[in-house]
């Protein structure tokens, strides 16, 4: 699986999850998030050669098409597969609120 | 929606579904598929600016991050959203077989 366990331990050029730390205030301008200051959102990148963690029949077909037609601009793209939520603390006036934001952390990638 | 109805009618530079005809024999080397000869598989391409058909909170965050950090390599990617099946005819020896291959035709795209 193209997950953090594999990708963070290997120098993988092809599609894999990459570490990306996002600081809410500095990187997004989100001053309203009080906790955490930032988090590892991570991201997916890298080429998708034929059959590499193909998401659908279409991505398999497109991967083969791209292999046999290297000049073609059509190819699968490395995108998130499994995502996890992130719990944040913010304030509404003087009232603290805790919310779980879904699909915030990329744990693995796929070729789609 | 970034679907064929919209994308095929507009000159859209950003993430959209694009027409792609694949000939089974010539483009994939699949001699075993007898009908159809080929089909419009289509593909997704184009930049994913902030908030453009964002698939998850992560892609929204990543889009914003990319907007505020243009030098960053991390950005959402334009990938298939809705896919349709394709019915094919092939032969096993002298016995015809009809099979519906799932997720073969891209009908719309998203930024993931």
């Amino acid at each position: 699986a193209l997950d953090t366990n594999y990708c963070f331990r290997n120098l993988e050029e092809n599609c894999c999850v990459r570490p990306l730390y996002i600081d809410f205030r500095q990187d997004l301008g989100w001053k309203w998030v009080h906790e955490p200051k930032g988090y590892y959102a991570n991201f997916c990148s890298g080429p998708c050669p034929y059959l590499r963690s193909a998401d659908t029949t279409h991505s398999t077909v497109l991967g083969l098409y791209n292999t046999l037609n290297p000049e073609a601009s059509a190819s699968p793209c490395c995108v998130p597969q499994d995502l996890e939520p992130l719990t944040i603390l913010y304030y509404v006036g003087r009232t603290p609120k805790v919310e779980q934001l879904s699909n915030m952390v990329v744990k693995s990638c796929k070729c789609s | 929606a970034l679907d064929t109805n919209y994308c095929f009618r507009n000159l859209e530079e950003n993430c959209c579904v694009r027409p792609l005809y694949i000939d089974f024999r010539q483009d994939l080397g699949w001699k075993w598929v007898h009908e159809p000869k080929g089909y419009y598989a289509n593909f997704c391409s184009g930049p994913c600016p902030y908030l453009r058909s964002a698939d998850t909170t992560h892609s929204t965050v990543l889009g914003l991050y990319n907007t505020l950090n243009p030098e960053a390599s991390a950005s959402p990617c334009c990938v298939p959203q809705d896919l349709e099946p394709l019915t094919i005819l092939y032969y096993v020896g002298r016995t015809p077989k009809v099979e519906q291959l799932s997720n073969m035709v891209v009908k719309s795209c998203k930024c993931s």
Epitope: - | K31, H34, E35, L89, V92, G93, R94, P96
Partner: antibody
Framework: EVQLLESGGGLVQPGGSLRLSCAAS????????MSWVRQAPGKGLELVAD??????????YYSDSVKDRFTISRDDSKSTVYLQMNSLRAEDTAVYYC??????????WGQGTLVTVSS | DIQLTQSPSSLSASVGDRVTITCRAS??????????MHWYQHKPGKAPKLLIY???NLASGIPSRFSGSGSGTDFTLTISSLQPEDFATYYC?????????FGGGTKVEIK
Amino acid sequence: EVQLLESGGGLVQPGGSLRLSCAASGFDFNSYGMSWVRQAPGKGLELVADIVSKTYNYTTYYSDSVKDRFTISRDDSKSTVYLQMNSLRAEDTAVYYCTVAPGGSFDYWGQGTLVTVSS
Amino acid sequence: DIQLTQSPSSLSASVGDRVTITCRASQSVSISRFNLMHWYQHKPGKAPKLLIYRASNLASGIPSRFSGSGSGTDFTLTISSLQPEDFATYYCQHSRESPWTFGGGTKVEIK
């Protein structure tokens, strides 16, 4: 260009044997099923024998009229298909065509070889 | 086995005529939307030639005056304007199941 060249036909006495050959070129012989189709004088086309590719275990078919007398075989290394005809009868007199069916239709045909069974 | 019955068994026509040949199968030769019926032209002393595959698809190099239609058990070969070189015997053939069989043929003669 696809070419199918039959040979081995001729005059043979009833009860005798003949071996027809069909040398193929211009296509991926190994991938496709090969057949022998005949036309007897004044009659229509009849599929006599058929052999599919190695992928499908060289499965063979014979029409009832030739079963247990004719044997179809192929040599993929030589791109050649054979029809061994034993215990020949007068009703086997016909032009025998070698043909290839990549799918459900017989797309390419040889020019045919005449087999005459007569005393 | 699936039997194919062609009609008529022979016909006389003139150059320029529209000719229709039918082929009826003893059971359906269609599977899903695919119609597994094919048509051939055969002239004396020559190899048979594929005209139409899967009911309505024109084989490579075949003039557009030839067309095919039908589904299920009933199929038609049409020559829109008969040419001198079209006088021959025409056969249908199915590939719905093994064994594949041919129809009895339709001989098209000059009137």
